[in-house]
Interface confidence: low
């Protein structure tokens, strides 16, 4: 279970055409459900139930986005439509280049993602928790253009990371 180094860039523009770019860094873990690869793309927040929809015509995005899914407490969804692994697969089928799960509320998902699938996804499936997850969700919840770069080694140059 290697460390995943995630750099998130938030892009905020104003009507005047001015803009600000914020960078923050966090760490997660590559799960065995996916590949230990670098990936990058625009962040698309996905609700766990949103991944239940089987209609592939709906909710398709251009290829190359990074899906971010905050998993809920198991008690809130006792009979999930898909396993966590199934949700990751569904996101990749829809064009995600990587999936990041916030497992803070559902730590059991870590074991599910690391059970060593016979047919792991060819894209990275990363999980984050604790302070790193809070950082990530703070950015995602801003509903602004944000981009995630996932690397399996630390960034080449030290980037100063700022809490949002």
């Amino acid at each position: 279970k290697e460390t995943a180094f995630v750099e998130v860039v938030l892009f905020e523009s104003s009507p005047s055409g001015d803009y600000t770019t914020y960078t923050t860094g966090l760490t997660g873990r590559f799960s065995r459900a996916g590949a230990t690869l670098s990936a990058e793309g625009e962040i698309v927040q996905m609700h766990p139930l949103g991944l239940c929809n089987n209609n592939d015509e709906e909710d398709l995005y251009e290829y190359g986005w990074v899906g971010v899914v905050k998993l809920e407490q198991p008690e809130l969804d006792p009979k999930p439509c898909l396993t966590v692994l199934g949700k990751a697969k569904r996101a990749v089928q829809r064009g995600a280049t990587a999936v990041i799960f916030d497992v803070s509320e559902n730590p059991e998902a870590i074991d599910q993602l690391n059970q060593g699938s016979e047919d792991p996804l060819k894209r990275p499936v990363v999980y984050v928790k604790g302070a790193d997850a809070i950082k990530l969700m703070n950015i995602v919840n801003k509903q602004k253009v944000a981009r995630a770069r996932i690397q399996h080694r630390p960034p080449r140059q030290p980037t100063e990371y700022f809490d949002m």
């Epitope: 770019t21 914020y22 960078t23 190359g64 981009r147 100063e160």
Partner: antibody, heavy 121, light 109 residues
Framework: EVQLVESGGGLVKPGGSLRLSCAAS????????MSWVRQAPGKGLEWVGF??????????EYAASVKGRFTISRDDSKNTLYLQMNSLKTEDTAVYYC????????????WGQGTLVTVSS | DIELTQPPSVSVSPGQTASITCSGD??????VHWYQQKPGQAPVLVIY???QRPSGIPERFSGSNSGNTATLTISGTQAEDEADYYC???????????FGGGTKLTVLG
């Protein structure tokens, strides 16, 4: 009006050094991620390098062709971007443009008019 | 790095549609941007993120990107559109910004 104005170009001998400046106005320079792009006479565009803003830790990255010889820096208090060019080669002869970058430095939405650097003996 | 290949030249009659292509390995999984450059002038961004048009750019400019090819389309081409056009992408694997070789668009007549 959003504007970028380059200066500092000129004739320099191979192995020599030169520093280009780019004065920015009409936008919040300290927020911007800035880049240099060059164009050899009669040729296409070539990305040179970039610098992130303060929030990005002023990180810089360079094209392989200039790495180790060129250094990008900025002075936010003066709204100015710099390109320090050392160990210049004849193939560095080009018009050098500074450009503002948008969307994680994918695209360049504002360009200066360019300044010509000629490296010749 | 990803390499972007453009045809050196494209000719079109006024009022017709001009299509300029940019090809590269799996280019459809990258964002592609297009610039127009007239002689002696700086480049101008005409399309970003495959198909977005900056404010001030006429609606006749449009873009698409899928598979290995991105295309800049100029419908109802006008004489003032005669220029060099460059595609560009951000190759995040190598953290470099890559330009195509450029295409000279000639408006006949």
């Amino acid at each position: 009006e959003v504007q970028l104005v380059e200066s500092g170009g000129g004739l320099v001998k191979p192995g020599g050094s030169l520093r280009l400046s780019c004065a920015a106005s009409g936008f919040t320079f300290s927020n911007a991620w800035m880049s240099w792009v060059r164009q050899a006479p009669g040729k296409g565009l070539e990305w040179v390098g970039f610098t992130k803003n303060e929030v990005g830790g002023y990180t810089t990255e360079y094209a392989a062709s200039v790495k180790g010889r060129f250094t990008i820096s900025r002075d936010d208090s003066k709204n100015t971007l710099y390109l320090q060019m050392n160990s210049l080669k004849t193939e560095d002869t080009a018009v050098y443009y500074c450009a503002r970058a948008i969307y994680y430095l994918e695209a360049f939405d504002v360009w200066g008019q360019g300044t010509l650097v000629t490296v010749s003996s | 790095d990803i390499e972007l290949t453009q045809p050196p030249s494209v000719s079109v009659s006024p009022g017709q549609t001009a299509s300029i292509t940019c090809s590269g390995d799996s280019l459809g999984s990258y964002y592609v941007h297009w610039y127009q450059q007239k002689p002696g002038q700086a480049p101008v961004l005409v399309i970003y993120r495959n198909k977005q048009r900056p404010s001030g750019i006429p609606e006749r400019f449009s873009g698409s990107n899928s598979g290995n090819t991105a295309t800049l389309t100029i419908s109802g081409t006008q004489a003032e559109d005669e220029a060099d056009y460059y595609c560009q992408t951000y190759d995040w694997m190598y953290s470099s910004r890559v330009f195509g070789g450029g295409t000279k668009l000639t408006v006949l007549g």
